[in-house]
């Protein structure tokens, strides 16, 4: 058993049929010694008396808010949560496996630039009685500071018969140099509590590996005389690290109709303009990627050909 | 130590070209190592990230773009950092800073070259003959060093009398390639910045 926060404790349980469970001793936070009784949640049934209560925690029915009273007055609370371990593996029931970029990916993180600011998000089908708390650091043995905000519900989607909820959090490394060469990864730890179930999820990464620039901005078209060709130009996204001659991007320019199966024109360039063939009912799209370290491509920025 | 915006050096563009070749060569070599050594811990997640140039060179700081010198986090990482007064430097100081930057890059390349050559000598003794260093990568390191045109004492190639541990050598190769790739990215950024300045 360990303390998650004041008056909230996590009991780690090996979860299998007829498991013996964990013996837990609760102590009432009071100077009083006599006349103390214990109850669980909203029940008025007295579980025991005395300054300490010893319980055998085996299942969720044994978890919850234990309260010690004296003469009708509440003295203190202890909330017990369960963290299940099945076949030596901690449970991951609360969050959905996003399976990208690999299986058992529960947290996904992205950074728009090298400033040390990044966003992580996760998915769940649970809509109520759900809380998250996020901590982060650079390295684990001698951790350097990363400050994370509160996790918030950022999107709701309908998937078949299910509703899916996306939560996200923004974090900022306390003293980040965009030009630095990372040797210690960022660690992100998410505590998830659903009703009386506790789970924790972690992710470890270098900012350079989670870079995904914003799409290029200000796409413009200039038809070329006596040709099917069009000159398309654009600018670096505002959120990208500066100076751009140091933090350079490379671009992919594509002309395609509405369907992915349609024919297309595609060209890669390090410049902020390119010449492509435009077709009726097609769109010109441009996306960006760090020129020197191939992490993710940005989303497409698009303009219609016509 | 930072890199102010400098007058373009006529010799800079070849360095940009060579640095691009360097990044390409080390990336290809790293990819080859990851494929060939698939049963060894050779991915970015599995290895310890070590920098053999740590406390010996200060390329990131010496080559910091002027625009980042206002960022204290970029300057306080090493006591060798050079903090400028105002945003403009006299051209003599400018070329001095650039020389510090380029000589730091040269020293990096020299250290990695020695490490890679020593390692290759060990790998050539491996009866499995599983992996060797790409001669193209070694040649590209050499070309960039020549383009930088710094003279410094030759570092003797380390020779080891004890029987090499091939497993350890291959893991060390992965560590070295990952670190060198990151440094090659920095070198490419620096050359691009200098070329544009």
């Amino acid at each position: 058993i360990w303390e998650l926060k004041k008056d909230v404790y996590v009991v780690e349980l090996d979860w299998y049929p007829d498991a013996p469970g964990e013996m837990v001793v609760l102590t009432c936070d009071t100077p009083e010694e006599d006349g103390i009784t214990w109850t669980l949640d909203q029940s008025s049934e007295v579980l025991g008396s005395g300054k300490t209560l010893t319980i055998q925690v085996k299942e969720f029915g044994d978890a919850g808010q234990y309260t010690c009273h004296k003469g009708g007055e509440v003295l203190s609370h202890s909330l017990l949560l369960l963290h299940k371990k099945e076949d030596g593996i901690w449970s991951t029931d609360i969050l959905k496996d996003q399976k990208e970029p690999k299986n058992k990916t529960f947290l996904r993180c992205e950074a728009k630039n090298y400033s040390g600011r990044f966003t992580c998000w996760w998915l769940t089908t649970i809509s109520t009685d759900l809380t998250f708390s996020v901590k982060s650091s650079r390295g684990s043995s001698d951790p350097q500071g990363v400050t994370c905000g509160a996790a918030t519900l950022s999107a709701e989607r309908v998937r078949g018969d299910n509703k899916e909820y996306e939560y996200s959090v923004e974090c900022q490394e306390d003293s980040a140099c965009p030009a630095a060469e990372e040797s210690l990864p960022i660690e992100v730890m998410v505590d998830a509590v659903h009703k009386l179930k506790y789970e924790n999820y972690t992710s470890s990464f270098f900012i350079r590996d989670i870079i995904k620039p914003d799409p290029p901005k200000n796409l413009q078209l200039k038809p070329l005389k006596n040709s099917r060709q069009v000159e398309v130009s654009w600018e670096y996204p505002d959120t990208w690290s500066t100076p751009h001659s140091y933090f350079s991007l490379t671009f992919c320019v594509q002309v395609q109709g509405k369907s992915k199966r349609e024919k297309k024109d595609r060209v890669f360039t390090d410049k902020t303009s390119a010449t492509v063939i435009c077709r009726k009912n097609a769109s010109i799209s441009v996306r960006a990627q760090d020129r020197y370290y191939s992490s993710s491509w940005s989303e497409w920025a698009s303009v219609p050909c016509s | 130590r930072n890199l102010p915006v400098a007058t373009p050096d006529p010799g800079m563009f070849p360095c940009l070209h060579h640095s691009q070749n360097l990044l390409r060569a080390v990336s290809n070599m790293l990819q080859k190592a990851r494929q060939t050594l698939e049963f060894y811990p050779c991915t970015s997640e599995e290895i310890d990230h070590e920098d053999i140039t740590k406390d010996k060179t200060s390329t990131v700081e010496a080559c910091l773009p002027l625009e980042l010198t206002k960022n204290e986090s970029c300057l306080n990482s090493r006591e060798t950092s050079f903090i400028t007064n105002g945003s403009c430097l006299a051209s003599r100081k400018t070329s001095f800073m650039m020389a510090l930057c380029l000589s730091s890059i040269y020293e990096d390349l020299k250290m990695y070259q020695v490490e890679f050559k020593t390692m290759n000598a060990k790998l050539l003794m491996d009866p499995k003959r599983q992996i060797f260093l790409d001669q193209n990568m070694l040649a590209v390191i050499d070309e960039l060093m020549q383009a930088l045109n710094f003279n410094s004492e030759t570092v003797p190639q380390k020779s080891s009398l004890e029987e090499p541990d091939f497993y350890k050598t291959k893991i060390k190769l992965c560590i070295l390639l990952h670190a060198f790739r990151i440094r090659a990215v920095t070198i490419d950024r620096v050359m691009s910045y200098l070329n544009a300045s």
């Epitope: 060709q229 024919k263 297309k264 390090d270 | -």
Partner: antibody, heavy 118, light 107 residues
Framework: QVQLVQSGAEVKKPGSSVKVSCKAS????????LHWVRQAPGQGLEWMGW????????EYAPKFQGRVTITADESTSTAYMELSSLRSEDTAVYMC???????????WGQGTLVTVSS | DIVMTQSPLSLPVTPGEPASISCRAS??????LHWYQQKPGQAPRLLIA???QSISGVPSRFSGSGSGTDFTLTISSLQPEDFATYLC?????????FGQGTKVEIK
């Protein structure tokens, strides 16, 4: 199986024209760009131009501009390349090639040898 | 027009050995470069698109690298069927242009 089948070899006199055909099978004809590329004996490949069979749009290499005409007939899934004012240096194997991507070629025809000789 | 220069023009290789072919562009073409294999009397066959993207059905022993002006096609271990002429093609701008070809011959 996508295939491009070209017309047979031709012998032409200098100053005349030649029209080579390229019939596509497998896949929808208008879903692909169609190009013509030639290869003179012992020489490299030379790109001549492309057509979008969907709308008849064409683009030609400046070297052949004014001498080459590429057309397409959607009803027969056939593309044509006509080269006029033939010279002896136009002796080459003419190949059609296609792809959904405009700028490179994933399926080629077998080639048609055009000999220009007086 | 962008001029593509291949080297060497002829490359004698022992079967089972690796081979590397170089292609250089007269100006920077990013990764807009494609590799083809051509056997005598046959049409070219696409091997690699955009400098390094593998093509389905092409053996994994063929790989490409490079960007800007310098590109390499590598065959990790030459098989008897790999003896042929290899061509690079740029797609950075029209007109599309090809290298003159590198003939890989049995040593």
């Amino acid at each position: 199986q996508v295939q491009l089948v070209q017309s047979g070899a031709e012998v032409k006199k200098p100053g005349s024209s030649v029209k080579v055909s390229c019939k596509a099978s497998g896949g929808t004809f208008s879903d692909y760009y169609l190009h013509w590329v030639r290869q003179a004996p012992g020489q490299g490949l030379e790109w001549m131009g492309w057509i979008d069979p969907e709308n008849g749009d064409t683009e030609y290499a400046p070297k052949f501009q004014g001498r080459v005409t590429i057309t397409a007939d959607e009803s027969t899934s056939t593309a044509y390349m006509e080269l006029s004012s033939l010279r002896s240096e136009d002796t080459a194997v003419y190949m059609c090639a296609r792809n959904k991507e405009l700028r490179y070629f994933d399926v080629w025809g077998q080639g048609t040898l055009v000999t220009v000789s007086s | 027009d962008i001029v593509m220069t291949q080297s060497p023009l002829s490359l004698p290789v022992t079967p089972g050995e690796p081979a590397s072919i170089s292609c250089r562009a007269s100006q920077s073409i990013s990764i807009n470069l494609h590799w083809y294999q051509q056997k005598p009397g046959q049409a070219p066959r696409l091997l690699i698109a955009f400098a390094s993207q593998s093509i389905s059905g092409v053996p994994s022993r063929f790989s490409g690298s490079g960007s800007g002006t310098d590109f390499t096609l590598t065959i990790s271990s030459l098989q008897p069927e790999d003896f042929a002429t290899y061509l690079c093609q740029q797609s950075n701008s029209f007109p599309l242009t090809f290298g003159q070809g590198t003939k890989v011959e049995i040593k």
